[in-house]
């Protein structure tokens, strides 16, 4: 069976069917359908037009504008909000009713695209094997990144997430047409990885997308991740006007120049250095989402009621932060370079700058208690590996799970390590799972490109398209038409069960409790030491305007450091790509597979981005919930700075009106936008097309500044600032 | 100018089928979709499917859907629209309408043909 | 389907008077356009994409709203104004609302 043409929303849309097999199977590709009008630079999607005729919807689209590789020059389009649509066929009639599962790619909110990078003329987030294996429709789309996306001056003039907004209208109109093309629009799934996953996350979290999304997946990211929310936006947004010319002083005409001015110039205002960093990756990236008080109303943690009946995945990598912490600490992939306490020292004092001298010392213990037993260069190696993994990326996923668990009402909650080792041959034997060697398993690529894969890679392939499609059709990864290899039994806070994804699996991969004694440091000890002012802070960094790699704002430190500006002196991107040069390991929209990866993939690693640190840990293990930390009477987050306030103010930790307590057990899910001394707030209606929910009309150039509570109701506690 | 001509009334016994005409003029015929809706006395409006005439690809409401067929002949620039199975409940005014421009705004409608179903 | 539901179903007003008849939709929708019919007349298009008017459009008819909450409103009613206008979402089923007669007072 076959589709022909189907008639969308726009007009009509004709792909390709592409037979498989001899037993009549086959599978309908749509490459390109818009799903929103051209963009313009700076300002919120708007709906498509429409067209006459039958769109030829054969090819994949250009990306959105965004940087090089080589971060000289740009790539893609402006005009980029298209996305792909991936539906399985069986032999007679029309498929009907078909789950539908979209991703959202990764890429630090600063690159990537909709196909993923080309390996093998196979595009990374080819949706074949998931949809023909798993019998669901799959979806991919492109939205806007880096200043193009995520550029905001923190107030209305240029409130930001348009990125976020053109993942909302996608999803809006998958929810509107997709039954056209044989899908349930009533059983949308999201899933993504790294800035994809935690995309998902804010998805969820957003009152803009009441009622359009069922179920969700995060691989290596979510809305809690500290590189996820940036909490001085401004800052970023001066730093690219200085760089192209626009006035600086008066918000308003800022944003004014900003918008006019031409968007590849906007895209090189901004540079990621790789190499000789004074501070780790993470803090360089300032272009992600913020809480702008209307698409993200207030601070995630305070959202989770908003997915209270979202079914939701979770997990990592076993070593996700394997590649940031290569990047961070170059001899960790060098057999003969050694890393020494000095040099993790450093870098622990980097992350834990608000805490000044004793939240580094603290840390360094915690992290070296091994080191006595085992000072092998191989064990600290995988400490330096763990630390980034743990503040990155498992900490903040942990309580992520917590937090949709104790608001869930219907909804269903799992969690997985995934730990089938990285298989990039330039990386030493003892390297796990690192940051999207998830994603071939997931898309597939065992099976699609079979000889760069061994069996047990098939195995792990089929495994994780199994659980993942079950879960989109029924909320249980167990329970579908795919069998699974053991029984996947629901994250709950009693027993913070997780699923290990290896190539053997059986009973003993639901595990309890994934590193306890780290996650407690976190939400516990680390939580309640004082914040330091800004002359107590360490390491001091650099200044002026010397050719030393620029310093970014550190979280919530009270100095705002210089972030890299362009024409920095920081060393240039590792050429890859179809340079010849050598490679680079997959990442965020890279992801390649095993073999190193070529073709146009090999987007270095860009980390994952934002200001701030792990945050606070749920209840784990046998212990009940964990000791609060102290409550000051606040209880609110702090706000982020609007308009010119300059660098971002610290937010109340430690015995200085620490953040509420998190509840436990049953007690009431937080408010779903904080605001005033309601009990809860209500949910803003939904809008697809780029205007805020009523009241705030129009596609209102006003941001509200998000709301603040000064209830003194439990709430969960406000996410660690590093 | 755009003008959107449609056949006569008619009337039929619930079993049967009607085919009812709309003659396009003034425009690319090949260049808009063409759009069925019907009003039945007294009711609301309630869309029926459409059709492109440059290739003849159509869309049916879910409601019409093993029904409806809608064909056109761009020789003469008409698209015919044939409701098989009639009931007593098709009795209604079947408008033929074109998009404005993009997709869905109907920018021009036909004058209407009144089908009766009665035995 | 996506359900369109219009209020009030009905209204008397008088010439001169501003009037306003709203939609709303069952889920988020991306366009949304309105249609004025007269008894015995073809329905004919006022206003589409939530805002524009086609030419020869009188400019007393304004449309506004996104999402799912849409307005129509007419600022000064004229003789020529009494009849039934409809709402109708863009999707690949397209739906209109139920309708809204507008009467003479």
């Known amino acids: 069976a076959k589709l022909g043409a189907v008639y969308t929303e726009g007009g009509f849309v004709e792909g390709v069917n592409k037979k498989l097999g001899l037993l009549g199977d086959s599978v309908d590709i749509f490459k390109g359908i818009p799903f929103a009008a051209p963009t313009k630079a700076l300002e919120n999607p708007q709906p498509h037009p429409g067209w006459q005729g039958t769109l030829k919807a054969k090819n994949f689209k250009k990306r959105c504008l965004q940087a090089t590789i080589t971060q000289d020059s740009t790539y893609g389009d402006e005009d980029c909000l298209y996305l792909n649509i991936w539906v399985p066929q069986g032999r007679k009639q029309v498929s009907r009713d078909l789950p539908v599962m979209i991703w959202i790619y990764g890429g630090a909110f600063l690159m990537g695209s909709g196909h993923g990078a080309n390996f093998l003329n196979n595009y990374l987030y080819d949706g074949e094997e998931i949809a023909t294996r798993g019998n669901v429709i799959v979806v991919t789309f492109n939205y806007r990144v880096g200043p193009l996306g995520f550029l905001s001056t923190g107030d209305a003039n240029l409130p930001g997430n348009y990125g976020l907004r053109d993942q909302h209208m996608a999803i809006a109109w998958v929810k509107r047409n997709i039954a056209a093309f044989g899908g349930d629009p009533n059983n949308i799934t999201l899933f993504g990885e790294s800035a994809g996953g935690a995309s998902v996350s804010l998805q969820t979290l957003s009152p803009y997308n009441k009622g359009l999304i069922r179920r969700a997946i995060s691989q290596s990211g979510v809305a809690l991740s500290p590189w996820v929310i940036q909490k001085n936006p401004l800052f970023w947004a001066k730093k690219v006007a200085e760089k192209v010319g626009c006035p600086v002083g008066d918000a308003a005409r800022m944003a004014q120049c900003l918008k006019v001015t031409d968007p590849r110039a906007l895209t090189l205002a901004y540079k990621v250095p790789l190499a000789g960093l004074e501070y780790p990756m993470l803090h360089y990236v300032g272009f992600v989402p913020v809480i702008d008080g209307d698409f993200i109303p207030a601070d995630p943690i305070n959202l989770y009621a908003n997915a209270a009946d979202i079914d939701y995945i979770a997990g990592t990598n076993n070593m996700d932060g394997h590649i940031f912490a290569s990047i961070d600490m170059p001899a960790i992939n060098k057999g003969n370079k050694k890393v020494t306490e000095e040099d993790f020292y450093k870098l622990v004092s980097e992350f834990t700058i608000t805490k000044g001298l004793r939240g580094a010392k603290t840390t360094f213990d915690v992290y070296t208690e091994s080191w006595a037993q085992d000072p092998s260069q191989e064990n600290k190696k995988k400490t330096v590996v763990d630390f980034e993994t743990d503040v990155l990326f498992l900490v903040p996923t942990e309580i992520a799970l917590a937090q949709h668990r104790a608001n869930a009402k219907s909804a269903k909650t799992y969690a997985y390590l995934f730990s089938h080792p990285s298989r990039m041959p330039v990386y030493p034997k003892w390297v796990g799972a690192d940051h999207a060697d998830d994603i071939q398993y997931v898309f597939g690529k065992p099976f699609a490109t079979p000889t760069g894969y061994r069996p047990q890679d098939r195995t792990v392939s089929k495994a994780m398209i199994a659980y993942w499609t079950n879960f989109a059709k029924t909320g249980d990864p167990n329970m579908g038409d795919s069998a699974v290899p053991t029984h996947w039994e629901p994250y709950t806070t009693e027993n913070s069960g997780y699923l290990e994804i290896t190539k053997k699996m059986g009973s003993s991969s639901m595990k309890r409790s994934l590193r306890t004694n780290f996650l407690r440091y976190w939400t516990l000890t680390y939580l309640a030491l004082p914040t330091v002012t800004d002359q107590e802070a360490t390491p001091v960094p650099p200044t002026g305007d010397s050719e030393a790699t620029p310093v970014p704002p550190t979280g919530d430190s009270e100095t705002a450091p210089v972030p890299p500006t362009g024409d920095s002196g920081a060393p240039p991107v590792p050429p890859t790509g179809d340079s010849g040069a050598p490679p680079v390991p997959p990442t965020g929209d890279s992801g390649a597979p095993p073999v190193p990866p070529t073709g146009d993939s090999g987007a270095p690693p860009v980390p994952p981005t934002g200001d701030s640190g792990a945050p606070p840990v749920p209840p784990t293990g046998d212990s009940g919930a964990p000791p609060v930390p102290p409550t000051g009477d606040s209880g609110a987050p702090p706000v982020p700075p609007t308009g010119d306030a300059g660098p971002p103010p610290v937010p109340p930790t430690g015995d200085s009106g620490a953040p509420p307590v998190p509840p436990t057990g049953d007690s009431g899910a937080p408010p779903v936008t904080p605001t005033g001394d309601s009990e809860t707030a209500p949910v803003p209606p939904t809008g697809d097309s780029g205007a805020p929910p009523v009241p705030p009309t129009g596609d209102s150039e006003a941001a509200p500044v998000p709301p603040t509570d000064d209830s003194k109701e439990a709430q969960m506690p406000a996410v660690i600032r590093f | 100018q755009v003008q959107l001509v449609q056949s006569g009334a008619e009337v039929k016994k619930p079993g049967a089928s009607v085919k009812v005409s709309c003659k396009a003029s003034?425009?690319?015929?090949?260049?808009?979709?063409m759009h069925w809706v019907r009003q039945a006395p007294g009711q609301g409006l309630e869309w029926i499917g459409v059709i492109n005439p440059s290739d003849g690809a159509t869309s049916y409401a879910q409601k019409f859907q093993g029904r409806v067929t809608m064909t056109r002949d761009t020789s003469t620039s008409t698209v015919y629209m044939e409701l098989s199975s009639l009931r007593s409940e098709d009795t209604a005014v079947y408008y033929c309408a074109r998009d404005y421009y993009g997709s869905s705004p109907l920018g021009y409608w036909g004058q209407g043909t009144l089908v009766t179903v009665s035995s | 389907d996506i359900q369109m539901t219009q209020s009030p179903s009905s209204l008397s007003a008088s010439v001169g008077d501003r009037v306003t008849i709203t939609c709303r939709a069952s889920s988020s929708i991306s366009y949304l356009n309105w249609y004025q019919q007269k008894p015995g007349k073809a329905p004919k298009l006022l206003i589409y994409a939530a805002s524009r008017l086609p030419s020869g459009v009188p400019s007393r008819f304004s449309g506004s709203g996104s999402g799912t909450d849409f307005t129509l409103t007419i600022s000064s009613l004229q003789p020529e104004d009494f009849a039934t206008y409809y709402c109708q979402q863009r999707s690949s089923s397209p739906t209109f609302g139920q309708g809204t007669k507008l009467e003479i007072k």
């Open positions: 003034g425009y690319t015929f090949t260049s808009y979709n």
